[in-house]
């Protein structure tokens, strides 16, 4: 029961996290114009991974895609890549984890297979969360660097004085959404990995006992039931006909609670 709850909760937390990563990636507010010196400015700029927008106090908004830039910064491309990789891995992880859920029965899928799938999806969620956190952190680092570099410059141009006053940018809402979402996906992944351990108990080999059938020299030998995390050939009980073989240690033993009669 605890395993099912842990797995289910891990799935839900990861689902929320991945939805948040998708939302953050699509959001335009990755960086926002810092209004420290002009809180009632009529025109306000904010930027995302895909476009830059201008909003006015009147409600007018105009957005332009980054294709107008002569050369996109490598940092922006890296952040885009990290976020997309995070989304793709998360989506695959969700797909795998649906089939791995203990509460869902698909054919005759064994616990060992579900354990493997749970572990796989858990690892995918962890990597997905780390990608999102890394992407957001790289962008945040760029903003912090730019914030302190933004100074007032004055230089002489070809036709007279040309003054450029830098405007500072600060963290947008998308950064916080991304950090929280990445953290949730990471936590969900860890929960899935913990659930995997519960789904797959420690490997146990039970002693096989042979029983002589009356009038026949044929023994029924349960094939050493083996619970493991792998897809081994010894995961089902097999009848082995070995011409009246004794127990594995050649000593007749009496039936125990583990024996099959």
């Amino acid at each position: 029961m605890a395993v099912t709850a842990c797995q289910g909760l891990g799935f839900v937390v990861s689902l929320i996290g991945i939805a948040g990563i998708i939302a953050a990636t699509c959001m335009d507010q990755w960086s926002t114009q810092d209004l420290y010196n002009n809180p009632v400015t009529a025109v306000f700029n904010y930027q995302g991974l895909w476009r830059s927008c201008v909003r006015e106090s009147s409600g007018f908004t105009e957005c332009r895609g980054y294709f107008t830039l002569l050369g996109l910064p490598a940092m922006l491309q890296a952040v885009r890549a990290l976020m997309i990789v995070g989304i793709v891995l998360g989506a695959i992880g969700l797909l795998v984890s649906i089939f791995a859920l203990k509460c869902i029965r698909i054919g005759s899928m064994e616990d060992s297979a579900k354990a493997n799938m749970t572990l796989t999806s858990g690892i995918m969620f962890i990597v997905s969360g780390l990608c999102a956190i890394a992407g957001v952190s790289v962008f945040a680092n760029m903003l912090v660097t730019n914030f302190w570099m933004s100074t007032a410059n004055m230089y002489t141009g070809m036709g007279g004085m040309v003054q450029t006053v830098q405007t500072r940018y600060t963290f947008g809402a998308a950064l916080f959404v991304g950090w929280v979402a990445g953290g949730l996906t990471l936590i969900g992944g860890v929960m899935m990995c913990i659930a995997c351990r519960g789904l797959a108990p420690e490997e146990t080999n039970y002693k096989a006992v042979s029983y002589h059938a009356s009038g026949h020299s044929v023994a029924y030998k349960p094939g050493g039931f083996k619970a493991s995390t792998g897809f081994g050939s010894n995961t089902k009980n097999k009848k082995i006909y070995d011409g009246g073989a004794r127990t594995e240690d050649e000593v007749q033993s009496y039936p125990s609670k583990h024996d099959y009669v």
Partner: nanobody, 120 residues
């Protein structure tokens, strides 16, 4: 880099009209507020008119009703239509723009200016 270039200035008689243009070129993402300022000889640079991307305009009291500012966002251009010109309007007219030119990069830029002379 970003460059602002004015055009349309010249010599005109009092009561005449002129149309100034200013185009922003270079690596531009968004143009925020664009405007016109002027500086007469021996005087401080003063605001003439400004326009936001949404079309909100602001004028100096001395030019209200005579000058009209407009902008074409698609062409990154701002215009100043000057009617009923007076000798007191003689000055160097400068174009100004708040330009978003990169990722978390925004600056306030000035053009080199264009001379407008109104003769009496």
């Amino acid at each position: 880099q970003v460059k602002l270039e004015e055009s349309g200035g010249g010599l005109v008689e009092a009561g005449g009209s002129l149309r100034l243009s200013c185009v922003a070129s270079g690596s531009i993402l968004n143009l925020m507020t664009m405007g016109w300022y002027r500086q007469a000889p021996g005087k401080q640079r003063e605001l003439v008119a400004t326009a936001t991307p949404g079309g909100t305009t602001n004028y100096a009291d001395s030019v209200k009703g005579r000058f009209t500012i407009s902008r074409d966002n698609a062409k990154n251009t701002v215009y100043l239509q000057m009617n009923t010109l007076r000798p007191g309007d003689t000055a160097v007219y400068y174009c100004n723009a708040d330009v978003v030119y990169g990722l978390a990069r925004q600056g306030n830029y000035w053009g080199p200016g264009t001379q407008v002379t109104v003769s009496s």
